[in-house]
């Protein structure tokens, strides 16, 4: 089957309940063109910030062409949940679906999209829309990766040694320093899937007075700086 090459198309907006909402649908320029009898299986990896709302879309097929629309949801450590709509009888059916935050956007006969209200870490998983037509099935799958913004701290703990921590991020953050020092980085993994990254750096060079910790993460980057306390009795070089 032809495989459309998908690029991310994230739309973010503010809703009434002040939660950012992101919707990932097909980037229309990337659709494969020969779709006569192709049973298309399209999968997209999608990072979504925790505590936002997410909307997942089905392939662009009009309701008049459909027999059944099914959303299949596979979350870690849980039985597969399915939400199905049968057009002929106008009935919806759910199997093993316990999370009330995962729902149809509206009536499935009006909109086949699936929404996740207030995305949590537990929503990490695979979501697939299956559209059954008289001539075969069209699929649209999402590997949903929930992103958690780490809390960043920077402090000096010994002579000319600074510690930068990116606490409970998902995925793990990356820490870099300006200027570079003699650094050691450790990662601590938590049961909920988040990671704490701790970078400890030492600067022997006495003309380094201010250091910056730069934390890179999929949810955004953050920089903090700190003035290194001079070593007692050491001469501090003058800045140009």
């Amino acid at each position: 089957a032809a495989q459309p090459n998908n690029s991310l198309m994230l739309q973010t907006s503010k809703e009434n309940h002040a939660l950012a909402s992101s919707s990932l649908c097909m980037d229309e320029k990337q659709i494969t063109q020969n779709y006569s009898k192709v049973l298309a299986e399209v999968n997209t990896s999608w990072p979504v910030k925790m505590a936002t709302n997410a909307v997942l879309c089905c392939p662009p097929i009009a309701l008049r062409n459909l027999i059944i629309i099914t959303w299949e949801i596979i979350l870690r450590g849980q039985p597969s949940c399915t939400k199905a709509y049968k057009k002929e009888t106008n009935e919806t059916k759910e199997t093993n679906c316990t999370d009330e935050r995962i729902t149809w956007v509206s009536r499935p006969d009006q909109n086949s999209d699936l929404q996740i209200r207030t995305v949590a870490i537990t929503h990490d998983g695979y979501y697939r829309c299956i559209m059954v037509t008289p001539d075969g099935n069209f699929h649209r799958g999402y590997h949903l990766q929930v992103l958690v913004t780490p809390e960043v701290t920077l402090f000096q703990n010994r002579n000319r040694t600074a510690v930068c921590k990116a606490v409970a991020g998902k995925p793990a953050a990356h820490i870099s320093w300006i200027p570079e020092g003699d650094c050691a980085t450790k990662q601590e993994y938590w049961s909920n899937g988040t990671v704490t990254v701790k970078s400890t750096c030492h600067w022997e060079v006495h003309n380094v007075s201010t250091v910056t910790c730069h934390v890179s993460h999929l949810t955004g980057n953050k920089s903090l700086y700190i003035e290194l306390l001079p070593v007692p009795g050491a001469k501090k070089s003058a800045k140009l």
């Epitope: 919707s23 779709y35 879309c57 662009p60 909109n111 008289p134 069209f138």
Partner: antibody
Framework: QVQLVQSGAEVKKPGASVKVSCKAS????????MHWVRQAPGQGLEWMGY????????NYNEKFKGRVTMTRDTSTSTVYMELSSLRSEDTAVYYC????????????WGQGTLVTVSS | DIVLTQSPASLAVSPGQRATITCRAS??????????MHWYQQKPGQPPKLLIY???NLESGVPARFSGSGSGTDFTLTINPVEANDTANYYC????????FGQGTKVEIK
């Protein structure tokens, strides 16, 4: 390959009915929605409605409701469009067009059937 | 009902130049991230031929001189560069549950 072949030209008197056929080949007939569109001389395209051969569902443009009937014969892979109570302004070329699933686009059209309504 | 308004009604373009046709919908034809707007070319005595689907996708076999853009209510068909055999009528179409065409744009090559 996918093909739609329509019936020949018709001349009808005002008040009469006309039934235009569209024979499909090269695909599973019952799997795809068929639309009907007409075009009066020198005018644009006007959607009349569709029939879904899979379940016999129809949906007509409000303008033609009560005058148009779309049917299908699965044994011959043919759809029909019948327009009744003809008037001179119904003189037009009538086209059938198959809707492709992806994007609801119409990739295959019949060659057109000229219907002339004249007393 | 959604009404589609095309402009201009006609235009004359020299070969090698760019032709731009716009189509405005009375309400959004975009849903779930897709714009259900298509463009067709019709030459005299022939049925329409699909050029662009879902606002910006080139139908198989159509020259890359044709391109489409837009979302929501405003859409554009561009022919660049125009060639002599592009003389035709061009129609935008909204196709989802109730289908509608724009009134057409006649393109003539000078």
């Amino acid at each position: 390959q996918v093909q739609l072949v329509q019936s020949g030209a018709e001349v009808k008197k005002p008040g009469a009915s006309v039934k235009v056929s569209c024979k499909a080949s090269g695909y599973t007939f019952t799997s795809y929605v068929m639309h009907w569109v007409r075009q009066a001389p020198g005018q644009g395209l006007e959607w009349m409605g569709y029939i879904n051969p899979y379940n016999d569902d129809t949906n007509y443009n409000e303008k033609f409701k009560g005058r148009v009937t779309m049917t299908r014969d699965t044994s011959t892979s043919t759809v029909y469009m019948e327009l009744s109570s003809l008037r001179s302004e119904d003189t037009a070329v009538y086209y059938c067009a198959r809707e492709d699933y992806y994007g609801s686009r119409w990739g295959t059209w019949g060659q057109g059937t000229l219907v002339t309504v004249s007393s | 009902d959604i009404v589609l308004t095309q402009s201009p009604a006609s235009l004359a373009v020299s070969p090698g130049q760019r032709a731009t046709i716009t189509c405005r919908a009375s309400k959004s034809v975009s849903t779930s991230g897709y714009s259900y707007m298509h463009w067709y070319q019709q030459k005299p005595g022939q049925p329409p031929k699909l050029l662009i689907y879902l606002a910006s996708n080139l139908e198989s076999g159509v020259p890359a001189r044709f391109s489409g853009s837009g979302s929501g209510t405003d859409f554009t068909l561009t022919i660049n560069p125009v060639e002599a055999n592009d003389t035709a009528n061009y129609y935008c179409q909204h196709s989802h549950e109730l289908d509608r065409f724009g009134q057409g744009t006649k393109v003539e090559i000078k």
